[in-house]
């Protein structure tokens, strides 16, 4: 489809010359961020963004590229490298110590330095990096967790947590040896290392005594308490804050987050991860974006202000189950989750960075008609006379062969929320991608990001934005509509 | 110019099926996109059903989504609306639309035919 305004010069022309109009009035604020907000999108290349555009657009009845994300309106944008000290290729839980603590790690350690060793708890003390979102509780802000993932989960722990194995769920989980040598899981860790005034996601299961049934699947053993410990860590966190509420369900958490008596706020909303997106109950789990909504509410009474860390978690597991259709209408709900943070706050006073902890082989190519679906297929076929999608990974769980040979596919097939696409090499689960990831960035000091950057110069632009340590001595004005 | 000659309609039991043809002359398609409307008694005219002549993209009212298929045969250019499980309330005046997509205005619909009418019976 060729829209008639495209074939005149002018358009593009008189379009250029708009946002050359609003680049040359950008001011970069030199006051200081009263507010953080750190959105990070798990899994979120740059291919995801670009196909999340278009199917966004589409749904909009739009041919697809032309329609802006949220993310999208930022005006600040710089690359970062996402490495682990260890690996080209990283993990969620290094690259959350890097741009949550500013410091790199090695691959599947969360919290500590590279001088910590995967899995050998002994090399844990003394290697902690302590998280923007920690230093921030320190200098009197009230900070909150958002994920769709479990709220133990790699990404958000980052913000409360220091462990040599990310997969040290709860006490379950660690071995004898490592619980001995006094490595605490990390749901313990959500309760106990800091005061968290707001926690969403999933992950009940972590926090109650195994045995204990699911409020939600009561009749699944399987989705019940996992503690051997014998503790009930909601119990404990309730006990040790006065206007604390726990939820489960999503009526619960608009009551509580309207509730001007509650303080602070931890909602499960599942025993593990959060439903995707297009499988969710809506009478029953929230929305990122409602999630996201409810913590601003409770976060932005702190006259000192926040800092927020909000995970669109589940990009990355539909990419690796090779399903782009998870991934990318996770990416879309992210993407509202991010215009809905940007109408309840202001970017005079609030820092908003969008990023990704990595990216995933998934690519998006083949010549496509525009305006024809992102899940469609390449208009010719490939040298075995058969169809393929304009959307594939490197690899995964999507390479089959049928009778000696790569199957063909239907545009019916293709579009199904189920489909899992092509690769070129079978795993069982489709692998992260090494390649720069961007960061978008508004409101104050956000013209700092800029250029190609490490991953851990994200955690030091929010930290001297906010003037938190080691950037006390920050030398900004005040954030706007606040005096000294 | 583009002329536009609807056919196909008729009535019909319910549950049966119709195919209404839409034949364009005067000039060929190229990258004009076909959209299907009706306009039943004293009601707005509504979307139905389009799709652009390359068949980069189609999209189906939620009324009709599964029983209706929107084709289109270049060599005859000719639009073709293959109407199946058709129900009472699917009575109506029947038009197809040719037109180009628009970045401002959307899809946008210059010409259009001088309809078919669909009666389903029940």
């Known amino acids: 489809i060729i829209p008639v305004e495209e074939e005149n010069p002018d358009f593009w022309n008189r379009e250029a010359a708009e946002a050359l109009g609003a680049a040359k009035k950008l001011q970069p604020a030199q006051t200081a961020a009263k507010n953080l907000i750190i959105f990070l999108g798990d899994g979120m290349g740059v291919s995801t963004v670009t196909a999340a555009r278009i199917l966004k657009g589409q749904k909009k009845d739009k041919l697809g590229p032309e329609i802006p994300l949220a993310m999208d309106r930022f005006p600040y944008v710089a690359l970062s490298k996402t490495y682990n000290v260890d690996k080209h290729v990283p993990d969620s839980g290094a690259t959350a110590t890097a741009y949550l603590c500013g410091v790199k790690g090695n691959f599947q350690t969360i919290g500590l330095s590279a001088a910590a060793r995967f899995n050998q708890c002994n090399t844990t003390r003394g290697n902690e990096v302590i998280s923007v979102m920690n230093r921030a509780k320190k200098a009197g802000k009230s900070v909150g967790v958002v994920t769709t993932t479990r709220v133990q989960h790699a990404s958000p722990a980052g913000t409360y947590a220091h462990t040599v194995n990310r997969n040290w769920y709860s006490d379950a989980d660690v071995p004898a040896s490592a619980r001995q040598e006094g490595c605490q899981d990390i749901a313990t860790q959500l309760i106990s290392n800091m005061d968290i005034d707001v926690i969403l996601g999933g992950g009940r299961k972590y926090m109650f005594r195994m045995g204990t049934p699911d409020p939600e699947y009561p009749d699944d053993y399987s989705q019940g308490g996992t503690r051997l410990d014998g503790k009930n860590l909601v119990q404990e966190w309730l006990a040790k804050r006065q206007g604390a509420r726990y939820v489960w369900n999503r009526t619960e958490l608009m009551q509580a987050s309207l509730d001007p008596s509650v303080t602070h706020l931890m909602g499960l909303f599942e025993p593990g991860d959060m439903k995707y997106e297009i499988h969710r109950d809506s009478t029953l789990d929230p929305s990122l974006m409602e999630m996201t909504e409810a913590a601003l509410r409770l976060l932005s009474r702190n006259p000192r202000g926040f800092f927020l860390f909000v995970e669109g978690g589940r990009i990355d597991h539909g990419h690796h189950e090779s399903r782009a259709y998870r991934a990318l209408t996770e990416t879309i709900m992210f993407d509202d989750a991010i215009e809905r943070a940007g109408q309840l706050t202001s970017e005079e006073d609030t820092l908003s960075l969008v990023t990704a902890d990595h990216s995933h082989v998934f690519s998006f190519g083949g010549y496509p008609l525009r305006g024809s679906s992102i899940f469609g297929l390449a208009p010719g076929k490939a040298r075995d006379r058969k169809a393929y999608t304009v959307l594939l990974y490197g690899n995964g769980p999507g390479y089959v062969l049928k009778d000696g040979a790569r199957p063909d596919v239907t545009e019916s097939e293709s579009g199904s929320p189920e489909y899992r696409q092509q690769s070129a090499v079978p795993l069982d689960e489709e692998t992260h991608a090494g390649e720069d990831v961007a960061v978008f960035a508004r409101g104050p000091q956000a013209h700092l990001v800029h250029g190609v950057q490490e991953q851990t110069f994200i955690a030091h632009v929010m930290a001297f934005a906010a003037c938190l340590e080691p950037y006390t001595a920050c030398d900004l004005a005040p954030p706007a509509g606040t005096t000294d | 110019q583009v002329q536009l000659v609807e056919s196909g309609g008729g009535l019909v039991q319910a549950g049966g099926s119709l195919r209404l043809s839409c034949a364009a002359s005067?000039?060929?398609?190229?990258?004009?996109?076909i959209g299907w409307f009706r306009q039943a008694p004293g009601k707005e005219r509504e979307f139905v059903a389009r799709?652009?002549?390359?068949?980069?993209?189609?999209r189906y009212d939620d009324s009709v989504k599964g029983r209706f298929t929107v084709s289109i045969d270049n060599a005859k250019n000719t639009a073709y609306l293959q109407m199946n499980s058709l129900k009472t309330e699917d009575t109506a005046v029947y038009y197809c639309?040719?037109?180009?997509?628009?970045?401002?205005?959307?899809?946008?619909?210059?010409?259009w035919g001088q309809g078919t009418q669909v009666t389903v019976s029940s």
């Open positions: 799709r652009t002549w390359d068949g980069s993209s189609t």
């Open positions: 005067g000039r060929a398609f190229g990258d004009y996109n």
């Open positions: 639309a040719a037109g180009r997509y628009s970045r401002v205005r959307g899809w946008e619909y210059d010409y």
